[in-house]
Interface confidence: medium
């Protein structure tokens, strides 16, 4: 069952699965210049059996110089409502995340593909969260969100972070300094697009969440 | 069932001090943020003061820095908010609350009157 | 501060009518608004947060839209329980904020 809607968004954080549950799709991306090749795979699919799982299908991305008249491929409508972005990830992974049953790793990159992956998640996985850099935590603990399914209807549990500006010792958690640049936070409330910018590469995750980083809902 | 439970309200006189506190049970106290909440009566609400898990990060509105103090003794699953220099603005139900994300979970609150 | 106005700061309304209520934020909130309910003598209740996502325990009725500046709270069918005062809140940045309160009575 796919989860219906995206996981919530914290201000100054950003979220990321260690590991996909058998299910997911992620769609099969191309950067721009490159599309997909003809009769090409639409997403790849997390499948398995109780011992192994992986990815199914896999994701090419050829010139669209090669054939002018092909346009750029975009997701149908009815799979854009349930788009989640991640950025890229480092290829690392995190220690613990080939020995879940029932879940695939990150896939590997392939050539040529989008800056960000859409992801469509369903029931049972778990994201979690990390403030950004230059933005520390107030709790303590794992900060997690998972879909759920409740009275027939999928949602994600709020996680339990707020992230504040580590160099604001006088003022309230979260005000940010004027910057150049914008806060950049979608606006859309049918297709929240989070972006994972800079998750600390993997490995360090393991040690991270022993420290104060993450926290979870505890309701 | 997470319960909040806010004492130490009363009625003062402007310029003196006053320590509200606010027992905690059930959820890991020492995880969590913590908050003052107050409501002047009749009136909206505002945030007083925040607090991190581990009381390294602590956070004012600007109308109460340098007079209060926001503080925690995870030890005993109890948030502090030490009042001075109290004046009449603020005289309002305070709230502790947690859960800041998640639902907010609220005490029933008390009521701090400052007056001459 | 992130200014937020609500408007109207009260309203009438019977037993079945469907009610709205708006929040406007002095500056983008980025969706990072939520919803309360307050009865007199009581702490404030959460009914919606993230904009549109309704907490647990929240009867259907209650829904949340917007975007950027403006944000609305409906009721769809209004029901006995529901006349209380509402509070609108960001916390896109510190300190949070809440609007100053929509009072509803009963017509």
């Known amino acids: 069952e796919l989860c219906d809607d995206d996981p919530p968004e914290i201000p100054h954080a950003t979220f990321k699965a260690m590991a996909y549950k058998e299910g997911t799709m992620l769609n099969c991306e191309c950067k721009r210049g490159f599309r997909r090749i003809k009769s090409g795979s639409l997403y790849m699919l997390c499948t398995g059996n109780s011992s192994h799982s992986s990815w199914d299908n896999q994701c090419q991305c050829t010139s669209s110089a090669t054939r002018n008249t092909t346009k750029q491929v975009t997701p149908q409508p009815e799979e854009q409502k349930e788009r989640k972005t991640t950025e890229m990830q480092s290829p690392m992974q995190p220690v613990d995340q080939a020995s879940l049953p029932g879940h695939c790793r990150e896939p590997p990159p392939w050539e040529n593909e989008a800056t960000e992956r859409i992801y469509h998640f369903v029931v049972g996985q778990m994201v979690y969260y990390q403030c950004v850099q230059g933005y520390r935590a107030l709790h303590r603990g794992p900060a997690e969100s998972v879909c759920k399914m409740t009275h027939g209807k999928t949602r994600w549990t709020q996680p339990q972070l707020i992230c504040t500006g580590e160099m604001e010792t006088s003022q309230f958690p979260g005000e940010e300094k004027p910057q150049a640049s914008p806060e950049g936070r979608p606006e859309s409330e049918t297709s929240c697009l989070v972006t994972t910018t800079d998750f600390q590469i993997q490995t360090e995750m393991a040690a991270t969440m022993e420290t104060s980083i993450f926290t979870t809902e505890y309701q | 069932q997470v319960q909040l439970v806010e004492s130490g309200g009363g009625v003062v006189q402007p310029g003196r001090s006053l320590r509200l506190s606010c027992a905690a049970s059930?959820?890991?106290?020492?995880?969590?943020?913590m908050a003052w909440v107050r409501q002047a009566p009749g009136k909206g609400l505002e945030w007083v003061a925040v607090?991190?898990?581990?009381?390294?990060?602590?956070y004012y509105r600007d109308s109460v820095k340098g007079r209060f103090t926001i503080s925690r003794d995870n030890a005993q699953n109890t948030l502090y908010l030490q009042m001075n220099s109290l004046r009449a603005e603020d005289t309002a139900v305070y709230y502790c609350?947690?859960?800041?994300?998640?639902?907010?979970?609220w005490g029933q609150g008390t009521l701090v009157t400052v007056s001459s | 501060d992130i200014q937020m106005t609500q408007s109207p700061s009260s309203l009438s309304a019977s037993v079945g009518d469907r009610v709205t209520i708006t929040c406007r934020a002095s500056q983008n909130v980025s969706s990072f608004l939520n919803w309360y309910q307050q009865k007199p003598g009581e702490a404030p209740r959460r009914l919606i947060y993230?904009?549109?996502s309704l907490q647990s325990g929240v009867p259907s009725r209650f829904s949340g839209s917007g975007s950027g500046t403006d944000y609305t709270l409906t009721i769809s069918s209004l029901q006995p329980e529901d006349f209380a005062t509402y509070y609108c809140?960001?916390?896109?940045?510190?300190?949070?904020?809440f609007g100053q309160g929509t009072k509803l009575e009963i017509k």
């Open positions: 059930g959820f890991t106290f020492s995880n969590h943020a």
């Open positions: 993230g904009t549109n």
């Open positions: 609350t947690t859960g800041l994300n998640s639902g907010y979970d």
């Open positions: 607090i991190s898990y581990d009381g390294s990060n602590k």
């Open positions: 809140q960001q916390y896109n940045s510190w300190p949070w904020t």
